[in-house]
């Protein structure tokens, strides 16, 4: 959301850094929340769970079944997902090379207890010449490839693993917990699951100028969620924002001095990263050492200033998710500037994208002047509207409070995720982006 | 008990043949990739042959290749070296071991072997 | 053809530890066994995938693998420990290779 100009451009293709052996991404336990979750139970041919395995007939993968049992081709939905996205890696990376599978769902018990293998949420791969050299880079396109945890394991085989199908981690989406507050114009804070439309909250400009701006929905929102946040602290000054592992955040430059605010660069479009300005990054991206923007009070002006990120965990929270949507494409949440926009990691990209969107509500407000938040059917509210309210949403879309407000992901952000899964690349969208239905 | 016993050595001439055996017990034999190593008297260990559990992948030294045959029986728990064209530096203490690897993607060491049976080319 | 290179002796006084190396090139993309042979004996495993030991093979036993150079360290040597020790190589394109074996004596 937000600051498109200034905050960056289109970024060039990355240099991937190969895993060392033995090293795992990301640095955490294979079944804690943060990689694959926890071991759900040993899937069996005869149990009632086997259905949820899918056999993965991908001539563009090369299996090597030692048992002869067809085995290794089963795996979930999300694991198969991920398989079929690095196969294509493979193949632009090596010309003629494959990907190959030597343990997929394993049901002889070779592993060790509780693994993954067992409930065809794990992989063993190589590449099809098996030329250990490739191996650590072959980890890394896993990775690229949006595996939840994958594992330099052997001189022989990278291990990767997914999240369970149900997990509430797997679908993470882009979104604040509940207890999060925002500023409002008329003074003090507000929990974000209180929101209303009408509340002009604290955001920042293209050229990081603090400013209010209306809040417009909730782009996703689930009063009931159980989900895993990034947590993101910083020292000077002591802030602490939980959000998505998808949700982006803005990241300071490096040559940003640490009393400036946020400089523009020439051009509009996403950050590039560099010194060219702030670039949004997904938070799961957010490492410690890098600064985000937080607001501080100078002279008794208010402005944003860089902050140094101390640590970066993670911590299940259950107050709800939600992702709300300014004007301006940019909120202050906790105190520190965050983007509205998630699940694709090119801010101004996204927040060309809510164009019609702002412009419908601006047409709306204009139209009918208080009757612009976000229409159910029946269900009156705190604020004006009630029946006869102009719907801005489609049927089942995420409500504003006071609006006969269902949960769920907005259809506008749904439409534009489906448009974004076929015109762009996978670096671009962030694994965790969706809560969709696997096909 | 895990156990591992090599026959078949013997005195033959040079461009003569000979066929060791390896009789396995105390484990599933098909499971585990087999091997023979040798070594010369007075010298080190020296890989001849392997005989992978996982597809049937075979492999010699380049010194023996040609002239020496691997092979296995899942049936019996046996694994063979039939050696054509023997040479003088043939001339060893032939064993046979065992490993749970498959040699392809897997590999764990010989962590079982036989006594040896002796070999011995000369005219 | 591919060549493991062992120092052919190494001596080490009670209760010390003894290094016995073996190198080769890329070393470390390799997984490393190690054998004890006494003479008149068959060899046996005492560290297989580099650093791991096989079950009733003491502690004292440790391997390691880096660059070009994987160690075997004997920590506490004891007069039992006086053997022959072969590194041995394995990858999952080139056949299985021996060192040239290293005679540990225990002063």
């Known amino acids: 959301c937000g600051p498109g100009r200034g905050f960056g451009k289109r970024r060039h293709p990355k240099k991937l850094t190969p895993l060392a052996y033995k090293q795992f991404i990301p640095n955490v336990a294979e079944k804690t929340l943060g990689a694959s979750g926890r071991y759900e139970g040993k899937i069996s041919r005869n149990s009632e769970r086997f259905k949820e395995l899918t056999p993965n007939y991908n001539p563009d993968i090369i299996f090597k079944d030692e048992e002869n049992t067809g085995a290794d081709r089963l795996m979930t939905q999300r694991c198969k997902d991920k398989l079929n996205a690095l196969a294509i890696s493979v193949m632009n990376q090596w010309p003629g090379v494959k990907l190959r599978v030597t343990e997929g769902w394993d049901e002889d018990g070779h592993h060790s207890e509780e693994s993954l293998h067992y409930e065809g949420r794990a992989v063993d791969i190589t590449t099809s010449d098996r030329d250990r050299s490739k191996y650590g880079m072959l980890a890394r396109l896993a990775v690229e490839a949006g595996f939840d945890w994958v594992y330099y394991e052997s001189k022989a085989h990278i291990h990767c693993s997914v999240k369970a199908e149900n997990s509430v981690a797997a679908k993470s989406g882009g979104c604040f917990p509940g207890s999060a507050t925002v500023h409002l114009e008329q003074g003090g804070t507000k929990l974000v699951k209180d929101l209303s439309p009408g509340d002009r909250v604290l955001a920042a400009d293209d050229q990081g100028r603090l400013l209010y701006s209306d809040f417009l929905t909730f782009l996703d929102r689930d009063d009931g969620a159980k989900k895993v946040f990034y947590v993101i602290e910083t020292r000077e000054p002591r802030e602490r924002l939980l959000l998505t592992a998808a949700h982006l955040l803005f990241v300071a430059p490096h040559n940003d001095s640490a009393t400036g605010e946020p400089e523009a660069s020439s051009g509009s479009g996403p950050p590039s990263g560099g010194a060219l300005g702030p670039r949004a990054l997904f938070a799961s991206r957010v490492r410690p050492g890098q600064r985000v923007y937080v607001v501080a009070e100078r002279d008794g002006d208010r402005r944003l200033l860089p902050a140094a990120v101390h640590s970066v965990t993670l911590s299940e929270e259950a107050a709800g998710a939600y992702a709300p949507l300014t004007a301006q494409g940019t909120i202050l949440i906790n105190r520190v500037l965050a983007s509205c926009y998630a699940v694709i990691e090119e801010h101004s990209w996204a927040h060309r994208a809510f164009a019609p969107f702002r412009l419908a509500h601006a047409l709306l407000a204009a139209l009918a002047p208080a009757r612009t938040d976000r229409g159910g059917d029946s269900g009156g509210g705190d604020r004006g509207g009630g029946g006869g309210r102009v719907a801005l949403t489609a049927p089942g879309a995420a409500d504003a409070p006071g609006a006969g407000a269902t949960a769920g992901i907005h259809w506008y952000s749904q439409l534009l995720y489906q448009i974004g899964t076929w015109l762009l690349d996978s670096e671009a969208l962030h694994p965790l982006g969706m809560a969709v239905k696997s096909s | 008990e895990v156990q591992l016993v090599e026959s078949g050595g013997g005195l033959v001439k040079p461009g003569g043949s000979l066929r060791l055996s390896c009789a396995a017990s105390?484990?599933?034999?098909?499971?585990?990739?087999m091997n023979w190593v040798r070594q010369a008297p007075g010298k080190g260990l020296e890989w001849v042959s392997s005989?992978?559990?996982?597809?049937?992948?075979?492999y010699y030294a380049d010194s023996v290749k040609g002239r020496f045959t691997i092979s296995r029986d899942n049936a019996k728990n046996s694994l063979y070296l039939q050696m054509n064209s023997l040479r003088a530096e043939d001339t060893a203490v032939y064993y046979c071991?065992?490993?749970?690897?498959?040699?392809?993607?897997?590999?764990?060491?010989?962590?079982?072997w036989g006594q040896g049976t002796t070999v011995t080319v000369s005219s | 053809s591919y060549e493991l290179t062992q120092p052919p002796s190494v001596s080490v006084s009670p209760g010390q530890t003894a290094s016995i190396t073996c190198s080769g090139d890329?070393?470390?993309?390799?997984?490393i066994s190690w054998y004890q042979q006494k003479p008149g004996q068959s060899p046996v495993l005492v560290i297989y995938?580099?650093?791991k030991r096989p079950s009733g093979i003491p502690e004292r036993f440790s391997g390691s693998n880096s660059g070009n150079t994987a160690t075997l360290t004997i920590s506490g040597t004891q007069a039992m420990d006086e053997a022959d020790y072969y590194c041995?190589?394995?990858?999952?394109?080139?056949?299985?290779?021996f060192g040239g074996g290293t005679k540990l004596t225990v002063l």
């Open positions: 105390g484990f599933t034999f098909s499971s585990y990739s």
């Open positions: 005989f992978s559990s996982s597809s049937s992948y075979i």
């Open positions: 071991a065992r490993d749970r690897g498959d040699y392809v993607d897997y590999y764990y060491g010989m962590d079982v």
């Open positions: 995938q580099d650093i």
């Open positions: 890329k070393l470390d993309y390799k997984y």
């Open positions: 041995q190589a394995w990858d999952s394109n080139t056949p299985l290779v």
